[in-house]
Interface confidence: low
């Protein structure tokens, strides 16, 4: 804790400069005003302060916000920003995508810090939902932010920002979380057609039902293999041999490459052995002719 | 350099509880899931117990359900096991472990719980 | 959830290759393929090796590599060496959402 000490004669600060970083710490409690401070935020970052001194700032600061600072401070905090705490943001009301963008620059570079995470909750919070130019913003400085949600935070995305998402944002997102983001993305883009769609869709696909797997059979799409690889076992199940003939185009010879892995094995195991033969690649553990299948359904225990 | 340093092992008596703490540094604590591993004496690794990056997810393995409880402070980057009703089986070196997608790419130096009366 | 079946020992001679095998069930090994392969020396932490099944971390020698057929899963070290000497352990997250290990294997180097 910095002392209560008068400031010395000829010393106090008329504006934020560069001479104060010759100040001591107890001379810049002592001499700079909180006011000042706050009205000339922006010009903090043009000085080189120590870290010491800029706790003394944050210090002034605290204690001319109490409940938290008001968004014209926030907007310039600056490399200030890296002195806050999770629990000092949580009091902050910010609400100017601009003031978001100034403050994700500082931490550019950089994996996501608990402030910036407070921060992002608090934005979006505050917004009540992800909107697209959020969505474009957070994912710009942070590809992985859209599958560091949760189902249940996921669900709040409207599909009008699923505009926003490039496929690389998508890498680290579970099932549970393309189960969610999937419906939105079929919404987002429905009055686009085949070629486009599919281009669009395709990283959503991990969350797709096999009513629409069926549909784009249909569509000449030509899926390959890595997309089809992450479809939901159960979606990928019910589909017949000529409808994944279909949807995976020349792309069918990949399967053999795939046999043993999920889905393509469970798929196999459901199809009968001649239907497979059809397809000339050699791929067996389909039922038998002549086996009556009774019951299809298989449990999946997906996670 | 990513850290994991474990404490709050040591000799408890049968029934006894104990806290184990685990201090993350190196990396952005909540952006990811941690687990507990931990190893008896001369023995197998053993999974104990899981959290999420916002602890939205928890799960623990059987032996320990209901006895332990396990917990996070990503403000304070630290990962926190709660063992009750301990038994001579709870007995190992605990580890506190980073989840990276499929692996647990970082360990902490483990600290040694002993149940004995 | 059983613990996944891995051979106590294995040994192996300088230069050589071995392959320790790592068996589980459609609940875990078969069903993701979310198996890592640790290094444990006598005293220390374990250290991942393999990731996701063949997946090597920066740092990881390439003479480690792993594998996956069914329920089994493989870590293969070529060109062993001396320093390679300790407990491997195959793990492999399930259809429970917990993770399950293997119960070691000791590589001694001869």
């Known amino acids: 804790e910095v002392e209560k000490t008068a400031c010395p004669s000829g010393k106090k600060a008329r504006e934020i400069d560069e001479s104060l970083i010759f100040y001591k710490k107890w001379e810049l409690e002592a001499c700079v005003d909180a006011a000042l401070l706050a009205t000339q935020m922006d010009r903090v970052n043009a000085i080189p302060f120590t870290y010491e001194q800029l706790d003394v700032l944050k210090h002034k600061l605290d204690e001319l916000y109490p409940q938290g600072y008001p968004e014209s401070v926030i907007q310039h905090l600056g490399y200030l920003f890296l002195k806050m705490s999770p629990e000092d943001i949580r009091k902050w009301n910010v609400t100017s995508l601009e003031t978001l963008k100034a403050l994700l620059e500082v931490n550019k570079g950089h994996e996501m810090s608990p402030q910036v995470a407070t921060l992002i909750d608090r934005f979006v919070k505050g917004r009540g939902q992800l909107d697209k130019d959020t969505l474009d913003t957070l994912t710009a400085f942070y590809p992985g932010y859209l599958c560091s949600l949760s189902p249940e935070e996921l669900s709040s995305v409207p599909p009008s920002s699923i505009w926003a998402v490039r496929p690389q944002d998508l890498d680290t997102c579970d099932p549970r979380q393309l189960d969610v983001l999937y419906p939105k993305a079929r919404l987002a883009f429905q009055n686009m057609n085949g070629s486009e769609y599919f281009v669009k869709i395709q990283s959503f696909l991990g969350g797709a039902p096999t009513e629409d797997l069926k549909a784009l059979s249909q569509q000449n799409v030509s899926m390959d293999l890595a997309t089809f690889m992450k479809l939901r076992t159960d979606a990928v199940l019910p589909l017949t041999v000529a409808e994944v003939q279909k949807l995976l185009g020349p792309h069918v010879e990949g399967l053999k490459a795939e046999e043993r892995h999920r889905p393509v094995r469970d798929w196999i195991l459901r199809q009968r052995q001649d239907d497979l033969d059809t397809l000339g690649l050699g791929l067996q553990g389909g039922i038998p002719n002549g086996y009556l299948v009774l019951d299809l359904s298989m449990q999946e225990a997906l996670s | 350099e990513v850290q994991l340093v474990e404490s709050g092992g040591g000799l408890v008596k049968p029934g006894g509880s104990l806290r184990l703490s685990c201090a993350a540094s190196g990396f952005t604590f909540s952006s990811y899931s941690m687990n507990w591993v931990r190893q008896a004496p001369g023995k197998c690794l053993e999974w104990v117990s899981s959290i999420s990056s916002r602890s939205s997810y928890i799960h623990y393995a059987d032996s320990v359900k209901g006895r332990f409880t396990i917990s996070r402070d990503n403000a304070k980057n630290s990962l926190n096991l709660q063992m009750n009703s301990l038994r001579a089986e709870d007995t190992a070196v605990y580890y506190c472990?980073?989840?990276?997608?499929?692996?647990?790419?970082?360990w902490g130096q483990g600290t040694l719980v002993t149940v004995s009366s | 959830q059983s613990a996944l079946t891995q051979p106590a020992s294995v040994s192996g001679s300088p230069g050589q290759s071995i392959t320790i095998s790592c068996t589980g069930s459609?609940?875990?090994?078969?069903?993701?393929?979310?198996v890592s392969w640790y290094q444990q020396h006598p005293g220390k932490a374990p250290k991942l090796m393999i990731s996701?099944?063949?997946n090597r971390p920066s740092g990881v020698s390439d003479r480690f590599s792993g594998s996956k057929s069914g329920n089994t899963a493989s870590l293969t070290i070529s060109g062993l060496q001396a320093e390679d000497e300790a407990d491997y352990y195959c793990s492999s997250y399930t259809s429970s959402s917990t993770w399950v290990f293997g119960c070691g294997t000791k590589l001694t180097v001869l």
């Open positions: 996701e099944v063949s």
């Open positions: 472990a980073r989840v990276q997608r499929a692996g647990l790419d970082y």
């Open positions: 459609s609940s875990d090994v078969g069903n993701y393929n979310l």
